[in-house]
Amino acid sequence: LNTTVLQGMAGQSLRVSCTYDALKHWGRRKAWCRQLGEEGPCQRVVSTHGVWLLAFLKKRNGSTVIADDTLAGTVTITLKNLQAGDAGLYQCQSLRGREAEVLQKVLVEVLEDPLDDQDAGDLWVPEESSSFEGAQVEHSTSRNQETSFPPTS
């Protein structure tokens, strides 16, 4: 699997969209996990609602939120108030019993806000305007890169 690289600004929100074949993954919950090293396991951060019909409802764990549009085949993960410690390799997964199929690998990079080093005055951005979504938002960078990380669950 290729790895998608997403960049977000510290303190802001980063939105990740993982697409999948909705018919192939019918009835399956989705999860967002963090890869612990190149060979390590993927540690579950958050998963969608236990009832598949309610997967569209947002589920939160700390500053991470997940919701699944099961008909469109898009699971959306939002990392709120991005911190330097959030940088790393993640996976979108489709769950079936103990089996976890990797839908997408995502490398999250956190950029320091340049305004942190100077007087920002009264400049501020409402939270609604400060979310990043893949390559669809002007301030976010998305690129694919080949990685040798094995798909782990």
Epitope: L23, K24, G27
Partner: antibody, heavy 122, light 106 residues
Framework: EVQLVQSGAEVKKPGESLKISCKGS????????IGWVRQMPGKGLEWMGI????????RYSPSFQGQVTISADKSISTAYLQWSSLKASDTAMYYC???????????????WGQGTMVTVSS | EIVMTQSPATLSVSPGERATLSCRAS??????LAWYQQKPGQAPRLLIY???TRATGIPARFSGSGSGTEFTLTISSLQSEDFAVYYC????????FGGGTKVEIK
């Protein structure tokens, strides 16, 4: 009419290879998983494996992993079950079945082929 | 691998009586359970999916219940065409079947 039609009965010798087929019609073949189920004479049903013809993603039961190969040709809406070296213990009826789905998120094998009887004897 | 255990192996019932078949999973399968009917020389037929929903065309005398590890298929009033072998199957993790229950005429 939605249906799965399987290839005819086979009589083989131990050590021979075999590939049986299951052709789907009346629905979008690439959008449903197809499973294979074994039923030995006088015995119950055993799930062997399953394939998604859309991308040929395949899963096997631990009991059958490495014993058989499941494949599909979406251009002719056909799934296959094959053996490289048959054994007498492979004598059984083999069914293919479509994994149906419902709006609740439930899935189950809703459409079944008529079965292919495989007899392995020297 | 999840193991499905059905009981009894054989159930002798008179026509018109109620039949209760049990299925137990070795670990929770939520409501991801189906029931099938198989008559001699025929392919299995789906009766119940999602533990309790009747498949298209299945008579109301068939009902399913349970969740987690314990499931039941009930045939409220057995008809002559209901004497067959019944299998439960989980599709929560793999697609394993139970060993079957043969419902025979008493």
């Amino acid at each position: 009419e939605v249906q799965l039609v399987q290839s005819g009965a086979e009589v083989k010798k131990p050590g021979e290879s075999l590939k049986i087929s299951c052709k789907g019609s009346g629905y979008s073949f690439t959008s449903y998983w197809i499973g294979w189920v074994r039923q030995m004479p006088g015995k119950g049903l055993e799930w062997m494996g399953i394939i998604y013809p859309g991308d040929s993603d395949t899963r096997y039961s631990p009991s059958f992993q490495g014993q058989v190969t499941i494949s599909a040709d979406k251009s002719i809406s056909t799934a296959y079950l094959q053996w490289s070296s048959l054994k007498a213990s492979d004598t059984a009826m083999y069914y293919c079945a479509r994994l149906g789905r419902w709006s609740s998120g439930s899935t189950a094998f809703d459409i079944w082929g008529q079965g292919t009887m495989v007899t392995v004897s020297s | 691998e999840i193991v499905m255990t059905q009981s009894p192996a054989t159930l002798s019932v008179s026509p018109g009586e109620r039949a209760t078949l049990s299925c137990r999973a070795s670990q929770s399968v939520s409501s991801n359970l189906a029931w099938y009917q198989q008559k001699p020389g025929q392919a299995p037929r789906l009766l119940i999916y999602g533990a309790s929903t009747r498949a298209t065309g299945i008579p109301a005398r068939f009902s399913g219940s349970g969740s987690g590890t314990e499931f039941t298929l009930t045939i409220s009033s057995l008809q002559s065409e209901d004497f067959a072998v019944y299998y439960c199957q989980q599709d929560d993790d793999g697609y394993t079947f139970g060993g079957g229950t043969k419902v025979e005429i008493k």
